[in-house]
Each structure stands twice: as C-alpha cells, then as structure tokens.
C-alpha cells in the first residue's frame, strides 16, 4: 500500500523549492525500479515529483488565501513490467498558514452619529476588521481591538470593536470627533500585524440650549402713517443648538396698549414686530412693550434647560407726519328743495389739521358748476335745481392744509334734491280716438292713463275729468277709475260724419300735490262710417291711408 | 550544445570536506537529472549520486552518510560535499548529466573532470 | 546493487579487427538498460550505445551493442586506430548506477 503522512506546505516560502514529503509504496524496497507520478492540478507546475524517489517539491510560492490544498494523484510504476504497482490515489497536500495578512476593516469608511450628552456606555458603532489568515491557525487571525485616537470621549471592546461612549460630549464645544481604532492579529503577542481605521463620529443635537436674545432692549419707529399689519422692525434670539432644535417662536409679553404683535419668520428665525392697531403720534408718541422667545419643538425630558424664557424689552417711538386734513365725517348728506334761488345754502363740511401745528383748511369742489364752496366749508347752489332734472348730486370736497398744499383730503359729499309740486299729470302718450256713426249711447271709446314728472312722498293720484264746456255738449262723459285712469264713453246714440267728422274733448287732469296741479289735455275722437259688425278697424284703415295719401271709396 | 566544467580545489586534506562545483553553460540546469561520478587513478568508475534541478536527491549508498548536493537553478550551478575525505577518496571527479524527468538514464554529457588528490 | 563484471579485462588487437566486449550483470538489468562508454587517456567517458543497443548520435555504426537479462556485448566490427581506449559498461535499469571494472582494447 502507499506510504505517506499528511502533506503541509508553509505558504510564502521564498526557497525556490520545498521539500513537501515522499509517495512511497511498502513494496519499494530502494533497489526496486518504480517510478512514481504525480497528476493533477498544479503537477508539474506547482508540485514537482522526483519520479524516481517519490519526493514532492512544492517550486512556486504557495499563497493559502489564494488556495489552501491541492488535490492530487499518486502513481507508481514498475519499469520492469510497465504496471501499476499500486493503484492510482488521491491526496491533499495542505498550504499551512503563516499570519502573513494584516487585518483589514472592509466596510471602511466608518461614520456614526450619536446624540450629544449621551450617557457613559452607549453604544455608538461596531467596527469589524477582517483577517484573511486562517482563524483555524494558531492566532493568526484572531483580533484585537484597541483605540489609537479619542481618548477619553470613547473607548472600544476589545473583542467585538464595539465603540461606546466613555465621556458626555457638548456639541455645541465640539461637533464631531475623529476616531482610530487599531485591529492586532495574534491577539496583539509580538509578531502580530495590525490595521487602523478612522471612524467619524458626528454628534447630533439636542435641544439643550434655550433661544436667549442678544439684545435686552430693542428701539424701534413706527411712523404714524403706518397701516395696520406693517413690519415695524426685527428682534433677533440665539439658539446654540441647531436645526429644529434652534426653531423658536416669539411672542408678547406685556403691551397694556395692545397695539403690537410679533410674528415668528421660521426661515431667518428673527421675530417681526408688527403694527395691530394703528398709532397717532398726536395721541401717543411712545410705547414699551416686552417679548418673549421659547423653543418651538422641546422634549419632556430636556425641560430644565428652558425653566425661564428669556425676554427683552422694546422701546417703539412714533414718528410724526404730516397728514392730510381729516374731515369730521367720512361723507355728507345734504338735503335742499328744487327750485330754490341761486345762492341757497346747502350744508357745511368742516376739516382739520390733525397735525400739532393746525393749519387752516382750504376747501374746493372738485368739477361742478352747481355748487360752491367758501373757506367755511359752507356749500351754496349758483343755479336754481330742477329734480326733475337731476334728484342728486355726487360731490367731491377737496379740503388743503394752506400751509402745505400737498396736504390734500377728498371726500364725498352728496346732495338729494327735493321734490317740490311743480309739475302737473299729463296724458302718459298721445290719444287719437274713434267713433261709429252708429255708436250707441254708453259705448268706450278710450282708456287714457296720466303720468306726472314730480316725485311722489306717497302713490301719485290723479282726478280726472271733462272741462266745462265739453260737460254740458253731452256728446262724450268721463268715469274716472280711481286708479289713475279712466274711460271715455260715448253719451249719445248716433253721430254724423258729414256734420261732424271729428271732436275735440278737452280733460283735466289733477294730481294729489299741495298744492295741487292740474292741466288740460285734449282727446281727439273721429267719427267712422263702420260696417254692420260696428268695428272701428276700417276707420282706423282709412285713417291710415288718408294719413300716407291715398283716398279710399 | 550544453558543456559542464567542474571546479573546485585540487587537493583536500584528510578529514576535511571536498567541495566541487559543476557549472552548466549552453542550457538550463531546470528539468533534469545532474549526477556526480568518481574514478580513482587506474580503477573504474563510480556513482556518487544525483540532484534534481528542484532539489530532491539520491545518493550511492556507499557513500551517502558523506555526501551532500546542493543546486541553485540561479546560477545554473549545482554542488558536491564530501565530508571526511580520506586517501581513498582521490579520483577524478565527473560532473554529467541524466536524464529528465522519469527513470534513470545514461549519463551524456560529461565534465572533462577534475582530480581531486587528498593528502595532508 | 547489480555488480557489473567486462571481460576480458585487456583485449590486444590490430586495426582492422573485430572486437567483441562482455558485460555480465548480476541479476537481471531492467529493460535493457545498460549503456557503454569510451574513454581515452586523460579524458571524460564518451557515449556510445545505451538501450543496449541504441547508437548514441555521432556515434559510427561499426560500433554496435546486443544482448538482455544478465548478457552483453560491445562490437567494434572494424577497429580503427582511434577506437583504441578503455570501454566501460553501465547499467541504468536501478539504484545504485553501476559501472563494469572496465575492457582495455589495446593495439597489438
């Protein structure tokens, strides 16, 4: 049978070839002639056989991490015969391991971010560092950790290359720390080879620093003119802590005045002092207020760094301007009868200097022939008024302060005309009548409706009736409807057209006024040659026809 | 074609160690057998041993407690010690070469041999 | 080992004569591994026949070498005056190599 023991070969022999062992067979006797084979991957090249003696060299540097055994075949031949004289075997030949690879941290670079204040022992991060020499080998593979760098803010275990936090960090001091972890193989007995790491380690914020202003008094203006909502000026806080831990909110916290708000800009954190209620420098030219700023977002557990807020004080001077003249009211209504003379006084504005310095006012009506205005503010008509012909006026008043005619104020004024009875009804249109020559007593003849061009307090009403001379001709009579309207009825059977074609009907027409008013209307009522049926539509059409020139059988 | 010279120091003392050396020119040393042959003045030849160009040897059992080959592939170069001469041991001394790989052959070429004498 | 015995230890012979040179081994020689050299005066052995009866290159074919097992022989079927030297036989078939004592072939 073969003969051999396992089969080691250190890896990185610098020899250009190593005795790795002998294949013998029992029956090689030394005097026997066999010759011995080697086969299989990495014979011939890597392994080399003294065919002769069976001895294996290795003749190439042998790297275990690359490959840690070969597999290979052994044959023995007898020359004498050309046979096998054992049968054809397999065995492996070991590359033993020498700590010939240093440990190496793979998943590099290294880069945790832990709370500040963190307590002692918190876990920040694990490094890992790889050996690529056989852990199975002695301790060539076997690590140690250590810390090179970041004492005494860390510490690292020595087996597992957990780092913890061994010191409370304030970043606010110092943000982030650079530290060295060394790996030693051969757990760290001479010999051994090491690699180093670097781990950034970022502390995160917390909310341990309350917002403090830099100020604790602040001088603001605000002119006088400003309107509500305006930005009157900026405070500003700090904050140490960063991102939303440095968000902060102000807000009042005395203004007996209630005249000022502050509003919180969230992108520069500054606070905006805005104006609520406008100011008067005339009334109070001067106002003290105090703000407060508290963290927007604090937790439960971090209370005790924002027990009291900080709080400034802030001074607000009014700054006076010259303003325009102020009317006592925002708009007039006068109040005058049409028909009055030229001159009549219509109603008095009255505007002042608001300013310390009281200006005289002068006043003006902006484009109108109608109105006049004195330095009074006294309003008078120069034309007499017609309702009928305009009920109101839309007036602008210009006040001016004399000493500053740039100082202008405009308001409205409006004038009502009021109706006086200066108008009589009349027929609301043009009435043109007809009659049959066969008509009987009794008939309608017209519906007519009045209208009057006064304005009525209440409903108009008209009263109507026929004049005194048409009252006794008895021809026609008139029944007044009481709804401001009324019939014409014939008052006779018969009427002839050859002795009387047409007939003038003179009515009165009176309204309800006081006084009351009445005019005279007259009715004009042709007399038809009709057809049996008695319609009045053929006269109408003669009428038309005569009316455009032609003449009719 | 490949020529071997041997060289080394003509005369040893007794009891001391002869040393030669068999340089190879016009070839490799790499993939072959390099044996060492003796002849005493007057007598016939004898093999002293082999080495292979990776290392591995054989010596003549008569004299293998004495001997030791070495090579250095290098230098194309390969050596003979042998320890504790005596008179005996006065020949010349061949350097040839074997075959390759495989079973033993003949031995072709040969050094022109150098005489090593052992006196005191 | 396998003990090589050449006879005859000297042969006297003149130009133009055939020699005939014996190797006898021990015990039997592995596949005919058996070669012979020629060696002149003051000079390293020189190739002639290996395989028993190979002709080794350069080598003239009056030289020629025969046998198996235990038995063989040299042949100079002509002899010139440069064949005149000391032959030795050697056998290659296992360990240790060995060599014969030796045939002088001397000028008569």
């Known amino acids: 049978g073969w003969v051999w023991n396992q089969f080691f070969v250190p890896e990185e022999m610098n020899t250009t070839s190593h005795h790795v062992g002998r294949l013998r067979s029992d029956l090689d006797n030394g005097n026997n002639s066999f010759q011995y084979k080697l086969l299989g991957a990495g014979a011939g090249s890597t392994f080399i056989i003294d065919e002769r003696t069976g001895d294996i060299y290795a003749i190439e540097k042998l790297d275990r991490e690359e490959r840690s055994l070969y597999i290979l075949r052994a044959q023995v031949i007898d020359i004498t015969t050309g046979r096998a004289v054992e049968p054809e075997s397999e065995f492996v030949i070991k590359v033993s391991d020498i700590n010939d690879n240093e440990p190496k941290f793979l998943d590099e670079p290294y880069e945790a971010i832990v709370p500040e204040m963190s307590p002692e022992g918190t876990l920040v991060i694990q490094v890992t560092a790889s050996d690529a020499d056989d852990p199975s080998s002695g301790n060539n593979a076997r690590l140690l950790y250590s810390l090179l760098q970041g004492q005494p803010y860390f510490s690292v275990e020595p087996t597992t290359g957990v780092i913890r936090i061994s010191s409370k960090m304030d970043r606010e001091l110092q943000d982030e720390y650079w530290v060295i972890i060394q790996a030693k193989d051969m757990i760290g007995q001479p010999g051994a080879l090491s690699g180093t790491t670097s781990v950034l380690i970022k502390l995160s914020d917390v909310n341990d620093n309350k917002p403090i202003f830099k100020e604790s008094l602040y001088r603001l203006t605000v002119s006088e003119s400003a309107p509500t909502g305006t930005s009157i000026g900026t405070i500003m806080a700090y904050d140490n802590d960063i991102g939303e831990n440095a968000e902060m909110d102000y807000s009042i916290e005395e203004d007996d005045s209630q005249t000022f708000d502050i509003i919180t800009n969230h992108e520069t954190q500054e606070g905006i002092v805005i104006l609520k209620k406008k100011v008067n420098f005339e009334h109070q030219n001067h106002y003290g207020i105090r703000a407060k700023v508290k963290n927007h977002h604090v937790d439960k557990q971090l209370m005790k760094y924002h027990t009291e807020a900080s709080t400034t004080f802030i001074k607000i001077q009014v700054e006076d301007v010259d303003e325009p003249p102020l009317f006592l009211l925002p708009y007039y209504i006068f109040e005058i009868f049409e028909e009055t003379p030229q001159g009549s006084f219509v109603g008095v504005v009255s505007a002042t200097d608001p300013d310390n310095r009281k200006s005289p006012i002068r006043y003006s009506i902006t484009r109108s022939k109608v109105f006049n205005i004195d330095d009074n503010g006294t309003i008078t008509t120069t034309n007499s008024l017609d309702r009928e012909i305009s009920a109101w006026y839309n007036l602008s008043i210009t006040a001016t302060e004399k000493y500053n005619i740039e100082q202008i104020s405009s308001i409205p004024v409006y004038v009502q005309v009021l109706n006086i009875n200066d108008h009589a009804p009349e027929f609301s249109q043009y009435y043109e009548s007809y009659v049959c020559e066969n008509a009987g007593s009794g008939q309608v003849i017209q519906t007519i409706s009045a209208v009057d061009r006064d304005e009525s307090i209440e409903e108009h009403h008209f009263y109507f009736n026929l004049s005194v001379e048409d009252t006794n001709s008895s021809s026609f009579t008139i029944i007044d409807n009481q709804d401001n309207t009324a019939v014409i009825l014939t008052n006779r059977t018969g009427f002839n057209l050859q002795e009387e074609p047409i007939f003038y009907i003179s009515i009165l027409i009176a309204d309800n006024g006081i006084p009351s008013l009445t005019s005279t209307n007259t009715l004009t009522i042709h007399v038809c040659d009709c057809d049996d049926s008695g319609s009045t539509q053929t006269c109408q059409y003669q009428e038309l026809m005569l009316s455009m020139g032609f003449k009719t059988e | 074609q490949v020529q071997l010279q041997e060289s080394g120091p003509g005369l040893v003392k007794p009891s001391e160690t002869l040393s030669l050396t068999c340089t190879v020119s016009?070839?490799?040393?790499?993939?072959?057998?390099w044996s060492w042959i003796r002849q005493p003045p007057g007598k016939g030849l004898e093999w002293i041993g082999y080495?292979?160009?990776?290392?591995?040897?054989n010596y003549n059992p008569s004299l293998k407690s004495r001997v030791t080959m070495s090579v250095d592939t290098s230098k194309n170069q390969f050596s003979l010690k042998l320890s504790s001469v005596t008179a005996a041991d006065t020949a010349v001394y061949y350097c040839?070469?074997?075959?390759?790989?495989?079973?033993?052959?003949?031995?072709?070429?040969w050094g022109q041999g150098t005489l090593v004498t052992v006196s005191s | 080992e396998i003990v090589l015995t050449q006879s005859p230890g000297t042969l006297s012979l003149s130009p133009g004569e055939r020699a005939t040179l014996s190797c006898r081994a021990s015990?039997?020689?592995?596949?005919?591994?058996l070669a012979w050299y020629q060696q002149k005066p003051g000079q390293a052995p020189r190739l002639l026949i290996f395989?028993?009866?190979s002709r080794a290159t350069g080598i003239p074919d009056r030289f020629s070498g025969s046998g198996s097992g235990t038995d063989f022989t040299l042949t100079i079927s002509r002899l010139e005056p440069e064949d005149f030297a000391v032959y030795h036989c050697?056998?290659?078939?296992?360990?240790?190599?060995?060599f014969g004592g030796g045939t002088k072939v001397e000028i008569k």
């Open positions: 395989g028993a009866s």
């Open positions: 015990q039997s020689v592995s596949s005919s591994y």
């Open positions: 050697q056998q290659y078939g296992n360990s240790p190599l060995t």
């Open positions: 080495i292979y160009y990776i290392g591995s040897t």
């Open positions: 016009g070839g490799s040393i790499s993939g072959y057998y």
């Open positions: 040839a070469r074997d075959g390759s790989s495989g079973w033993y052959r003949w031995f072709d070429p």
